[in-house]
């Protein structure tokens, strides 16, 4: 025979073709072998001009031989070489699919590989590629878009060889709250790390507000609206500054009375105050908390105390906010001016968390009267709020 060629090569099959001998022959003897593969020999009819090679090893160079037989006579042997394709990984699956994450898993191909090429694409045409190592059989996808169809494909690599791609299709789950109106909704969306988040007042995407979320204290989901920790920020500010907010939300800051009014107008909120001083801690929780609008001069409502710090906020309940340039307290003197801060002063305060940091003079410092009195300025203080029904929402999410 002559003109031995191979065609239709895959990772496990190939088709051998040849030109028949000029003389009539009884049979052809075909043999093929590869590195680490024992030789296989097959005899086929003398009028056959092709033979399907099966059960081949992937990514293997084979040597194929053929000769003709007629009675006791044998023709000379002709030879061809071919290399099977790299076989594909198997069983690509997307599991643990969340709103922004998914886990891809697969089984490795039979052939040894030098790595894998992962490609994932969303319906909007966003394509991302990543190459992972040869021993990897799973990969966590992150920063996905919620409620989005994705096609994930994987291809094995071995030097210049590339397998066929296999694919799987999955859809990320929708966010419970696409535009979270507070940190509790951000948390129910699956965000469990404390830090900066964007919330949307009344769930309106045009009303974005960057806030610091405390996702750890008492179950998390708190919008922090005041932090004192080192005295670097000046809290002896005017009415306009307290209305708008000031400071660095990762450090010392005040979120702003306008923001507090808008947030607490969204529903029933609770207040938590966390205090720390020289290794001691205390907290106060009020199950009803709201701040009125500018017309009420941001009137405070705070009721339903529990905690370890003592009920110092009750004294301030029903009071309007006061600053040195807008005196709304019930004292003859200006409380904000007298005590170098700002608060929902009455005459004057049991709480002065916006007082002078580190000032232990009577009533001048960061005070929470029923914990450390008026002659000790507290080192660390945070005020934060979340929906009063957060526990119910959290339980519902866990059941879901």
């Amino acid at each position: 025979p002559s003109g031995l060629v191979t065609a239709n090569i895959t990772d496990s099959e190939a088709l051998a073709r040849w030109q028949p001998a000029i003389a009539t022959v009884d049979s052809y003897v075909i043999s093929y072998t590869g590195e680490k593969v024992p030789e296989i020999t097959r005899t086929v009819s003398g009028n056959t001009v092709e033979y399907a090679l099966t059960d081949l090893e992937p990514a293997t160079e084979y040597t194929l031989r053929i000769f003709a037989e007629k009675g006791p006579q044998k023709s000379s042997t002709i030879t061809a070489k071919f290399t099977t394709d790299l076989d594909s990984p198997r069983d690509l699956t997307a599991t643990e699919v969340q709103s922004e994450t998914a886990l891809l898993t697969w089984r490795p191909p039979r052939a040894s590989v030098t790595g894998y090429l992962l490609v994932y694409e969303s319906v909007d045409g966003t394509v991302k590629e990543v190459i992972v190592g040869p021993d990897t059989t799973s990969y966590s996808l992150a920063d996905l878009s919620p409620s989005t169809h994705y096609t994930a494909k994987i291809q094995a690599l071995n030097g210049p060889l590339r397998s066929n791609m296999i694919q799987t299709i999955f859809t990320t789950i929708g966010l419970l709250y696409p535009f979270p109106k507070d940190c509790s909704q951000a948390m129910l969306n699956g965000d469990t790390t404390s830090g900066l988040y964007t919330i949307y007042l009344n769930g309106d995407k045009a009303e974005a507000l960057e806030v610091f979320c405390d996702m750890t204290s008492d179950g998390g989901g708190w919008i922090v609206f005041l932090r004192r920790k080192n005295g670097r920020e000046n809290f002896y500010q005017n009415w306009k500054a307290y209305a708008a907010g000031f400071g660095d939300r990762r450090e010392e800051f005040w979120l702003g009375l306008d923001n507090l009014n808008k947030i607490t107008a969204q529903g029933q909120y609770e207040l938590r105050v966390d205090l720390r001083d020289h290794g001691e801690t205390a907290f106060a929780v009020y199950d009803k908390f709201s701040v009125g609008d500018a017309k009420t001069r941001y009137k405070l409502k705070v009721e339903g105390y529990s905690g370890t710090a003592g009920d110092s906020m009750a004294y301030h309940n029903g009071r309007s906010f006061s600053t040195f340039d807008k005196d709304t307290d019930s004292a003859i003197t200006n409380c904000a001016l007298s005590y170098k801060g700002a608060f929902w002063y009455r005459n004057c305060h049991r709480v002065n968390l916006m007082g002078r940091y580190g000032d232990n003079n009577h009533s001048q410092g960061v005070n929470w009267f029923h914990w450390k009195g008026h002659e000790h300025s507290i080192q660390f203080a945070e005020m934060k709020l979340r929906p009063s029904n957060f526990r119910n929402l959290e339980g519902r999410r866990k059941r879901a």
Epitope: D311, S330, A331, C348, S363
Partner: antibody, heavy 120, light 107 residues
Framework: QVQLVESGGGLVQPGRSLRLSCAAS????????MHWVRQAPGKGLEWVSG????????YYADSVKGRFTISRDNAKNSLYLQMNSLRAEDTALYYC?????????????WGQGTMVTVSS | DIQMTQSPSSLSASVGDRVTITCRAS??????LNWYQQKPGKAPKLLIY???NLETGVPSRFSGSGSGTDFTLTISSLQPEDFATYYC?????????FGQGTKVDIK
């Protein structure tokens, strides 16, 4: 209208017990801390005891600590003062009083008082 | 405990007189000071809270001032119904304490 009415006073021998009650009406009782204040005959006012709106926190003057117990039943809008081991110096007119807002605050509503006389 | 000292302990005045009663706290109490009026056989009545705020229904001839440790109750023009005993009270901390009282009688 807002009203406090005390009852339970009377003549009692030293060492014995007495329980005073105060019935409240006209306001949301459990929103407010309540106090007992006493006035010995011909003398000034002396704060005796106080209790938070929920009943979770209680406070006593040193002179009655360990002998008197303040309590409240918010379902019944009632305040109580259990007085044990009574002494002659406990003889006084006992008033219950409502605070304006917080535990330590002005007393804006007072009852008419109930007289306790400790004598053998 | 915070001691409250009132002066004078008694005073005689005529209708129309301006009367001033002072109250001193043994320690700094911001403006946590209240004034009460008590007539014989009656319960005390709140007049002034937070040192200077007039309780609802109290005539405007009564006024309060002061902060820190020194406080004053002033009756601008004494009326017949004002003859009574007046008490100051600190609500700064527990135990809340009262002054010993100032008796205002007719001259």
């Amino acid at each position: 209208q807002v009203q406090l009415v005390e009852s339970g006073g009377g003549l009692v021998q030293p060492g014995r017990s007495l329980r005073l009650s105060c019935a409240a009406s006209g306001f949301t009782f459990d929103d407010y801390a309540m106090h007992w204040v006493r006035q010995a005959p011909g003398k000034g006012l002396e704060w005796v005891s106080g209790i938070s709106g929920s009943g979770g926190s209680t406070y006593y003057a040193d002179s009655v600590k360990g002998r008197f117990t303040i309590s409240r039943d918010n379902a019944k809008n009632s305040l109580y003062l259990q007085m044990n081991s009574l002494r002659a110096e406990d003889t006084a007119l006992y008033y219950c009083a409502k605070v304006m807002s917080s535990m330590e605050d002005a007393f804006d509503i007072w009852g008419q008082g109930t007289m306790v006389t400790v004598s053998s | 405990d915070i001691q409250m000292t009132q002066s004078p302990s008694s005073l005689s005045a005529s209708v129309g007189d301006r009367v001033t009663i002072t109250c001193r706290a043994s320690q700094y109490i911001q403006g946590f000071l209240n004034w009460y009026q008590q007539k014989p056989g009656k319960a005390p009545k709140l007049l002034i809270y937070d040192a200077s705020n007039l309780e609802t229904g109290v005539p405007s001839r009564f006024s309060g001032s002061g902060s820190g440790t020194d406080f004053t109750l002033t009756i601008s023009s004494l009326q017949p119904e004002d003859f009574a005993t007046y008490y100051c009270q600190q609500s700064y901390s527990t135990p809340q304490t009262f002054g010993q009282g100032t008796k205002v009688d007719i001259k």
